[in-house]
Amino acid sequence: APTSSSTKKTQLQLEHLLLDLQMILNGINNYKNPKLTRMLTFKFYMPKKATELRHLQCLEEELKPLEEVLNLAQSKSFHLRDTKDLISNINVIVLELKGSETTLMCEYADETATIVEFLNRWITFCQSIISTLT
């Protein structure tokens, strides 16, 4: 059974992940972002089901494409810290949260998503899991 300290650690990691994803989304949605139209042409893939921490495997598998699209707007459009570092940090958190005991084959939904829909989906996921922990 999870201890209160492990629950607290999980909650803090989810909050960190949530803040990183929200920061990216805020940067993209910034009204000054001239890259939004271009960024929206890139397709992202969503999980059929995302209700447990192990489903973060689906986020992990889309982090490289996410980094590529963020690189399109790194310097001028929104002020993220180095994209590579940001994605790397997210990756570390995701790996810790999902655990390595069970290797899940992610099941993806048939329909694709824009970067905005993709980020919103994972923000909602984080918020949902955090609410069950508190």
Epitope: F42, E62, K64, S75
Partner: antibody, heavy 121, light 113 residues
């Protein structure tokens, strides 16, 4: 149809700079990124970087960072690649290229004819 | 950076025979979301720019003869010319088209035996 037409061959002295142009036609230059790839004589292909002509955003390969400058002039549908502090190893054919479609950044489907840059004292 | 290792360096094949070129990447090029492998194959003839033959590991570019086919997944890929023609003499390159910087294999020179 999509066409990329590059400027002519150049002979340059070591330490100088070269500026190669790439004129796009058959599509709006702001629709997609323009990439630059080089090929030394008898060697393989090496990606140098891309520019987004819409806003001048660039992404350079680490190897060329600080020596290459990519620019674009949307009024003439032309992209430029300037390489400074030339050395003999920069002798190569320089290509501009465009991706297959605008739904991913690569691969390159449309290529300029290439510009030979010779660096010699 | 992803390293692309191509083999063999050169290949001599009789006209009408099959030519096979291999490419190995140092990281998986499979994007599981769409089950696409971000690998492309190019043909380059002397004095010409590269020509895209195959993308997504196995999709033929428009106008490319169907004797050219691509296969493989993850880290191991193959370009096959089912029946070599005289006009196929060229250097062939693989390209990982997944992550910046995009990286090419060193090339395979195909000649007629």
């Amino acid at each position: 149809q999509v066409q990329l037409v590059q400027s002519g061959a150049e002979v340059k002295k070591p330490g100088s700079s070269v500026k190669v142009s790439c004129k796009a036609s058959g599509y709006s230059i702001t629709d997609d990124l323009i990439h630059w790839v080089r090929q030394a004589p008898g060697q393989g292909l090496e990606w140098m970087g891309w520019i987004d002509p819409e806003d001048g955003e660039t992404n350079y390969a680490q190897k060329f960072q600080g020596r290459v400058t990519l620019t674009a002039d949307t009024s003439t549908s032309t992209a430029y690649m300037e390489l400074s502090s030339l050395r003999s190893e920069d002798t190569a054919v320089y290509y501009c290229a465009r991706s297959l479609d605008s739904t991913w950044i690569y691969p390159f489907a449309y290529w300029g004819q290439g510009t030979l840059v010779t660096v010699s004292s | 950076d992803i390293v692309m290792t191509q083999s063999p360096d050169s290949l001599a094949v009789s006209l009408g025979e099959r030519a096979t070129i291999n490419c190995k990447s140092s990281q998986s090029l499979l994007r599981r979301g769409n089950q696409k492998n971000h690998l492309a194959w190019y043909q380059q003839k002397p004095g010409q720019p590269p020509k895209l033959l195959i993308y997504d590991a196995s999709t033929g570019q428009s106008g490319v003869p169907d004797r050219f086919s691509g296969s493989g997944s993850g880290t191991d890929f193959t370009l096959t010319i089912s029946s070599l023609q005289a006009e196929d003499v060229a250097v062939y390159y693989c390209l990982q088209s997944y992550i910046t910087p995009p990286t090419f294999g060193a090339g395979t020179k195909v000649e007629i035996k």
